[in-house]
């Protein structure tokens, strides 16, 4: 038995003409199974292979190879989130989050915990204690005086 | 089994928006386009749209464009169609149905009367 | 946007009766055709895709044929619950138009 074109197998019982639209991206074997083009993939070869380690969770694409990132999520794979807007001496493990590094503190982690190690700012042989974000304090040896024992 | 499961009746008044609901089971969800026809009483089958559930793209008849939006709820397997300034001729069966190659699978339909 | 024409819009025919329905549409869609039955306050049911491939659980008597412009469902012999009204549709490009019906009545 000759099939009609884009029939198949026994009894001619299956079709499959190849396209390239918006209802999918395939061509034919010779039992008129869907053979997806490159980059497509799913039962009907209309979903696309992202850029491969494009993140599953937060990254997908419409054409092949591309890889969009969902909202509060950047980088090429879109597996690096965006921190809080603002965000200076900190990280994120989840969009819009400010985790301060060691020594930093305050939202936007901009205020210097220790800003006596930062800055040195006590002269003289003065000892400096950090006192607070962005403060300290000056204990300064015998006959030097002043908020950095400069006098 | 495959189902397609759709809201219930609504009355809506000429001017309103109508927002049908259609929850499948039975396969994945995302693997398979919905579509929606309508059917007027006593007149034939219209087709108003598709849309491709994995991506949320849709595509509609023109006749309805601007009128019709379709969207997908994929935590829920649940398709959705609204269409808004609603007249007396959207009076209708809405059904939704699943396929490429035909539609071996519909909704029960879902009537939307409308009437001042 | 392609026309689906089929004809006859309606048809009396008697039990044990060979009926044809045509659909021809405005340009080619290939065999990118279905056909569906529909009983009143029902959904319509999947009979024939692709214009030739008799869906899942359709009994044998129906059959469908062409390509291109031209399509055919035909019943061989028809039986009490034959009698509905049969719509074709295209799948080749959107719209996926339907055909007008056909109204398919006991004699």
């Known amino acids: 038995v000759t099939c009609d074109d884009y029939y198949y197998g026994f009894g001619c019982n299956k079709f499959c003409r190849p396209r390239d639209d918006f209802f999918g991206h395939y061509a034919c074997d010779q039992n008129g199974n869907k053979t997806c083009m490159e980059g497509w993939m799913g039962p009907e070869c209309n979903r696309a292979i992202c850029r491969q380690g494009c993140s599953p969770k937060h990254g997908s694409c419409k054409l092949p190879g591309d890889c969009r990132c969902q909202y509060g999520w950047q980088g090429l794979y879109c597996d690096k989130c965006i921190p809080h807007p603002g965000c200076v001496h900190g990280i994120c493990n989840e969009p819009w989050q400010c985790l301060c590094e060691t020594n930093w503190g305050g939202q936007l982690c901009d205020k210097d915990l220790n800003y006596c190690g930062t800055h040195q700012p006590c002269l003289n042989g003065g000892t400096c204690s950090n006192t607070g974000p962005d403060k300290y304090q000056c204990s300064c040896p015998e006959g030097y005086s002043g908020p950095n024992c400069e006098i | 089994q495959v189902q397609l499961v759709q809201s219930g009746a609504e009355l809506k008044k000429p001017g309103a928006s109508v927002k049908v609901s259609c929850k499948v089971s039975?396969?994945?969800?995302?693997?398979?386009?919905i579509h929606w026809i309508r059917q007027a009483p006593g007149q034939g089958l219209e087709w108003m749209g598709i849309?491709?559930?994995?991506?949320?793209?849709?595509k509609y008849a023109q006749k309805f464009q601007g009128r019709v939006t379709m969207t997908v709820d994929t935590s829920t397997s649940t398709a959705y169609m609204e269409l808004s300034s609603l007249r007396s001729e959207d009076t209708a069966v809405y059904y939704c149905?699943?396929?490429?190659?035909?539609?071996?699978?519909w909704g029960q339909g879902t009537l939307v009367t409308v009437s001042s | 946007d392609i026309q689906m024409t089929q004809s006859p819009s309606s048809l009396s025919a008697s039990v044990g009766d060979r009926v044809t329905i045509t659909c021809r549409t405005s340009e080619n869609i290939y065999s990118y055709l279905t056909w569906y039955q529909q009983k009143p306050g029902k959904a319509p049911k999947l009979l024939v895709y692709?214009?030739?491939i008799l869906a899942a659980g359709v009994p044998s008597r129906f059959s469908g044929s062409g390509s291109g412009t031209d399509f055919t469902l035909t019943i061989s012999s028809l039986q009490p619950e034959d009698f509905a009204t049969y719509y074709c549709q295209h799948h080749y490009d959107i719209p996926w138009t339907f055909g007008g019906g056909t109204k398919l009545e006991i004699k």
């Open positions: 039975g396969y994945a969800f995302t693997d398979y386009a």
């Open positions: 692709n214009a030739k």
């Open positions: 849309i491709n559930t994995y991506y949320g793209d849709s």
């Open positions: 149905a699943r396929g490429y190659d035909g539609f071996a699978y």
